[in-house]
Interface confidence: low
């Protein structure tokens, strides 16, 4: 099913279809970041791979900047999202 | 309605440079994550070359066989994506896309590139 | 680099059956926060490609549902539940894990 992809979907629904998008791959950084899904962020190697946006494979920056509440209420949501 | 359209495809020689455009629209542009890929004729997919928005700071990362030679570059007030290319070999021959996106969402129609003497 | 391997490279269909193809990368593309970072993309004879399935089972926007993608750390599938006419074309899977991002050699779909 697509229910939970749909749900952030709706979360973003005042954006458009291409907005949407690049909204859940902004959620999912979030999730990244502050390990909301209880993984631990890959280890900090030369090798490491930490997908901080999906495409994105640098090491943790240094200025990552802290959630709002909002945006940890919708992390909350993320962390429900499992594929299909 | 999302569209990318590039431009500045060609016939080139060997050795010789050229610059693709990807002109932007239907989205917000500056928070886009953006990529190359290129289709040699008759061949796959191979990814080029990716740029960031600026916010998360601008860095672009290359395919190794392009690295050095080509750079890719944007203009957020123009809404355009460019890559230029230098040194061209025979083997940059391809049809060349611009994607959006983290997972190319959305993609150009292509821009013919060839490379010949 | 990490390696895509897709299988078949051809694939004959009947409209209404159902098709699968295969994609094997040389290392798991499943992250230690589960996701698994591998889309399937379909390119339409004359056409640029487009996106299906995004981080290895989500469908992108307007993609139909009979199209579905799952798989384990290294072996990924993309089904089509009933193959329409529109369906063909060449299919090929990508990760996205690290870069450089590496496409697989491409499956190509047509109508028996």
């Known amino acids: 099913s697509v229910s939970e992809i749909q749900l952030m979907h709706n979360l973003g629904k005042h954006l458009n279809s291409m907005e949407r998008v690049e909204w859940l791959r902004k959620k999912l950084q979030d999730v990244h970041n502050f390990v909301a899904l209880g993984a631990p962020l890959a280890p900090r190697d030369a090798g490491s791979q930490r997908p901080r946006k999906k495409e994105d494979n640098v090491l943790v920056e240094s200025h990552e900047k802290s959630l709002g509440e909002a945006d940890k209420a919708d992390v909350n949501v993320l962390t429900k999202a499992k594929s299909q | 309605e999302v569209q990318l359209v590039e431009s500045g495809g060609g016939l080139v020689k060997p050795g010789g440079s050229l610059r693709l455009s990807c002109a932007a629209s239907?989205?917000?542009?500056?928070?886009?994550?953006m990529s190359w890929v290129r289709q040699a004729p008759g061949k796959g997919l191979d990814w080029v070359g990716r740029i960031k928005s600026k916010t998360d700071g601008g860095t672009t990362d290359y395919a190794a066989p392009v690295k050095g030679r080509f750079t890719i570059s944007r203009d957020d007030s123009k809404n355009t994506l460019y890559l230029q290319m230098n040194s061209l070999k025979t083997e940059d021959t391809a049809v060349y896309y611009c994607t959006t996106g983290a997972t190319f969402d959305s993609w150009g129609q292509g821009t013919l590139v060839t490379v010949s003497s | 680099d990490i390696v895509m391997t897709q299988s078949p490279l051809s694939l004959p269909v009947t409209p209404g059956e159902p098709a699968s193809i295969s994609c094997r990368s040389s290392?798991?593309?499943?992250?230690?926060?589960?996701?698994?970072?591998l889309d399937w993309f379909l390119q339409k004879p004359g056409q640029s490609p487009q996106l299906l399935i995004y981080l290895g089972s989500y469908r992108a926007s307007g993609v139909p549902d009979r199209f579905s993608g799952r798989g384990s750390g290294t072996d990924f599938t993309l089904k089509i539940s009933r193959v329409e006419a529109e369906d063909v074309g060449v299919y090929y899977c990508?990760?996205?894990?690290?870069?450089?991002?590496?496409f697989g050699q491409g499956t190509k779909v047509e109508i028996k």
């Open positions: 239907g989205f917000t542009f500056s928070n886009a994550w």
């Open positions: 990508m990760q996205a894990l690290q870069t450089p991002w590496t």
């Open positions: 290392q798991s593309l499943l992250h230690s926060n589960g996701y698994k970072f």
